[in-house]
């Protein structure tokens, strides 16, 4: 009977992401057959969250929209782990919105999750960012300095990297 | 090649507003933001704002909030700035210039003269 | 806000003299330090941004360094046409600010 009702539960949430995501990838948590972690499929997986690389080239606010229709954000980065995760799924010739923007062009940047940023622990190119006009961040390559962020005009296309968290069923 | 063209000298009574304009030509204008500085003999140069051209949006100098406004006119390539109740201490030169890379104004116009006098 | 100090408001070299002109930041500033150049009829250009870095069309004559607070502008050939007033200004902070310039004249 409990296995049962655990197995009615996962069913109802799965069918809460299935608008979104029509499948899910999971894999067990732990030792535990009852705890499962999933993100959607072919999102790539990283600690307690999932992440898509969109390649389709639009504004940082059409890439932050897409990301939200799926249910996830663009992506914020927190630790030099998270962001060596993320460049193994990039293509050095491109550029990725990050969800990171001045939006009032005064050099105080913030993550669309609110959140805090935090100077210790950024990414950004040597001499970046360098230009009140360019308020969106990108992460890219740069032969001298290999992956790094660096700021643009938000209204540029680019192509976008979401993340949302893990689905725990 | 980049050029900002301003307006022509003016001289006004105390207590009234006047409009200054910088045409930006030579370079796509809603790429760059518009700086405005003003020059006394007094303080040699001060950073007055900076307009968006393209969110149109503005950060000001503290100093210089109430005193100065800052506009454009995507249409014309235009920037304004319109100083209000003017008093001798606004006689100055005022120079437009373009944001640049690296926090700077790689371009600059050849400055408006704005004498107050009664 | 930054102050920006330049110490020597004004100096007074010969024809192909080495001239170095200072400007001091009351905080560090982070190497957003920019020079212009005031000619006397009122233009004023771009030399150097980010320090070091030339500005399209500058003769390599000027160049400049330093970090943290002190930098400075350095001609390496006076020429007749660098007579005019010199000014820094750091980018680092809003509001942005200017050194006094310094006023480079002719022996």
């Known amino acids: 009977n409990f296995m049962y009702s655990k197995t009615v539960k996962r069913l109802s949430k799965l069918r809460e992401y299935q608008q979104y995501h029509p499948s899910l990838t999971c894999v067990m948590e732990g030792k535990d057959i009852e705890d499962w972690s999933c993100c959607p499929t072919p999102w790539t997986s990283f600690q307690s969250s999932c992440y898509f690389i969109s390649t389709g080239m639009q504004s940082w606010t059409k890439s932050q929209k897409n990301c939200s229709v799926m249910g996830a954000d663009l992506v914020v980065i927190n630790t030099r782990e998270e962001q060596d995760f993320i460049i193994q799924n990039l293509k050095r010739n491109s550029s990725y919105f990050l969800g990171l923007s001045d939006p009032g062009g005064r050099r105080h940047w913030q993550w669309v999750d609110q959140t805090p940023y935090n100077e210790n622990v950024t990414f950004w190119h040597s001499g970046e960012p360098n230009n009140l006009d360019e308020r969106c961040a990108i992460i890219n390559f740069r032969s001298s300095e290999e992956w790094g962020w660096n700021d643009i005009h938000c209204h540029v296309p680019q192509k976008s990297i979401c993340k949302m968290k893990k689905i725990y069923i | 090649q980049v050029q900002l063209q301003q307006s022509g000298a003016e001289l006004v009574r105390p207590g009234v507003s006047v409009k200054i304009s910088c045409k930006g030509s030579?370079?796509?204008?809603?790429?760059?933001?518009m700086h405005w500085v003003k020059q006394s003999h007094a303080k040699s140069l001060e950073w007055i704002g900076v307009?968006?051209?393209?969110?149109?949006?503005?950060n000001y100098n503290q100093k210089f909030k109430g005193k100065a406004t800052m506009t454009v006119d995507k249409s014309s390539t235009t920037a304004y700035m319109e100083l209000a109740r003017l008093t001798s201490e606004d006689s100055a030169i005022y120079y437009c210039?373009?944001?640049?890379?690296?926090?700077?104004?790689?371009?600059w116009g050849q400055g408006t003269s704005v004498t107050v006098s009664s | 806000d930054i102050q920006m100090t330049q110490s020597t408001s004004s100096l007074s070299a010969s024809l192909g003299d080495r001239v170095t002109i200072t400007c001091q930041a009351s905080?560090?500033?982070?190497?957003?330090l920019n020079w212009y150049q005031q000619k006397p009829d009122g233009t004023v250009k771009l030399l150097i941004y980010?320090?070091?870095r030339l500005h399209t069309g500058v003769p390599s004559r000027f160049s400049g360094s330093g970090s943290g607070t002190d930098y400075s502008l350095t001609i390496s050939n006076l020429d007749q046409e660098d007579i005019a007033t010199y000014y820094c200004?750091?980018?680092?902070?809003?509001?942005?600010?200017f050194g006094g310039g310094t006023k480079l004249e002719i022996k």
């Open positions: 980010y320090t070091s």
């Open positions: 307009i968006s051209t393209y969110y149109g949006d503005s």
């Open positions: 030579g370079y796509t204008f809603t790429d760059y933001s």
């Open positions: 210039a373009r944001n640049g890379n690296f926090y700077v104004m790689d371009y």
């Open positions: 905080q560090d500033i982070s190497n957003y």
């Open positions: 200004q750091q980018g680092n902070t809003l509001p942005w600010t």
